[in-house]
C-alpha cells in the first residue's frame, strides 16, 4: 500500500491533523523534499550575517558575512573578522606584517617575500607589507656583454623541489 | 557539569560604565567562541558582541559599537563586556553564550542555535 505522504511536493508536508493531506508549509518555514512530514523553519540571517538568498516554501536561506567579515565553513557558519592588506589576524586582532613578509588579501596570514637569490634572480622591486618582491634577471645577466633576452625559467609547481 | 556564570550587572547612571564577567567551567573554553546576548523586557533577544575562542575575531551590533568592548581571557577561562557610555535602553538582562564548532577559534556566530551553554543572565539597569 503507497504512503498517502509519498504525493506531498517540496514546499508542502504530510499534515496528520488533516488526514495527511498536503498542507503549504507555514511562513518562514520550508521543505525541500517531497513527503515530509514537517517543515523545516528557515534560517534567519541576523547580526554579523546578511541574507544572500531569502528562503521560499522549497528552499533553505542563505547567508552570507556583513562587511567586514567573510564566511568559514559550508553554508557560511561563522564569520571571520576582515584585516586590511599587509596585516593578517591574531589573537589580540589585525596586526601588521613583521618586515620580510606581505599579505595582499583581506583574510589569511602573512607570508614571507620570495629569496629572489634562490633561483640565482636579482630583486627588480622590493617588497612591501602588501606586496611581494618582483625577481628581475640573474645578476649574470646584467653583466657588460650579456644577451639582454634570456629564455624563461622552467615552469615549477608550488611545493615540489627541481628534478 | 558545564557552567556559564554572569557578574558584575546593577544600577547605573546614563553616561556610566558597567564590566561584566562570564566566568566558565566544565568545557574546553579557548576552543568556544562567546557571545553576550541581552533581553529587554517584553523584548526579543539581541546579539550584543561575540568573540572568536582566539579572541583575534570580534563582533558588535550597531547599537553598542564604539561604547562596548568584549575581551577573553582564556588562562582564567572568563568572557568579559565592557559597557562605557551607558543609556536608558540598554537596560536588559545580559547572557553569556558558548558554542563550539569546526571555526569557532577563527570566527563568530550570531545564530542563536549555535550556542551550545546559555548563563543564567545579570541585570542591568540605566536609569537616573
Known amino acids: 500500500l503507497q504512503d498517502p505522504c509519498s504525493n506531498c511536493p517540496a514546499g508542502t508536508f504530510c499534515d496528520n491533523n488533516r488526514n495527511q493531506i498536503c498542507s503549504p508549509c507555514p511562513p518562514n518555514s520550508f521543505s525541500s523534499a517531497g513527503g515530509q512530514r514537517t517543515c523545516d523553519i528557515c534560517r534567519q540571517c541576523k547580526g554579523v550575517f546578511r541574507t544572500r538568498k531569502e528562503c521560499s516554501s522549497t528552499s533553505n536561506a542563505e547567508c552570507d558575512c556583513t562587511p567586514g567579515f567573510h564566511c568559514l565553513g559550508a553554508g557560511c557558519s561563522m564569520c571571520e573578522q576582515d584585516c586590511k592588506q599587509g596585516q593578517e589576524l591574531t589573537k589580540k586582532g589585525c596586526k601588521d606584517c613583521c618586515f620580510g613578509t606581505f599579505n595582499d588579501q583581506k583574510r589569511g596570514i602573512c607570508r614571507p617575500w620570495t629569496n629572489c637569490s634562490l633561483d640565482g634572480k636579482s630583486v627588480l622591486v622590493n617588497g612591501t607589507k602588501e606586496r611581494d618582491v618582483v625577481c628581475g634577471p640573474s645578476p649574470a645577466d646584467l653583466s657588460p656583454g650579456a644577451s639582454s633576452v634570456t629564455p624563461p625559467a622552467p615552469a615549477r609547481e608550488p611545493g615540489h623541489s627541481p628534478q | 557539569e558545564v557552567q556559564l556564570v554572569e557578574s558584575g550587572g546593577g544600577l547605573v547612571q546614563p553616561g556610566g560604565s558597567l564590566r561584566l564577567s562570564c566566568a566558565a567551567s566544565g568545557f574546553t573554553f579557548s576552543s568556544y567562541a562567546m557571545g553576550w546576548v541581552r533581553q529587554a523586557p517584553g523584548k526579543g533577544r539581541e546579539f550584543v558582541s561575540a568573540?572568536?575562542?582566539?579572541?583575534?575575531?570580534?563582533y558588535y551590533a550597531d547599537s553598542v559599537k564604539g561604547r562596548f568592548t568584549i575581551s577573553r581571557d582564556n588562562s582564567k577561562n572568563t568572557l568579559y563586556l565592557q559597557m562605557n557610555s551607558l543609556r536608558a535602553e540598554d537596560t536588559a538582562v545580559y547572557y553569556c553564550?558558548?558554542?563550539?564548532?569546526?571555526?569557532?577559534?577563527?570566527?563568530?556566530?550570531?545564530?542563536?542555535?549555535?550556542?551550545?551553554?546559555w548563563g543564567q543572565g545579570t541585570q542591568v539597569t540605566v536609569s537616573s
Open positions: 553564550a558558548a558554542g563550539s564548532g569546526l571555526y569557532s577559534s577563527y570566527g563568530v556566530s550570531t545564530d542563536p542555535s549555535f550556542y551550545d551553554y
Open positions: 568573540i572568536s575562542g582566539y579572541g583575534g575575531s570580534t
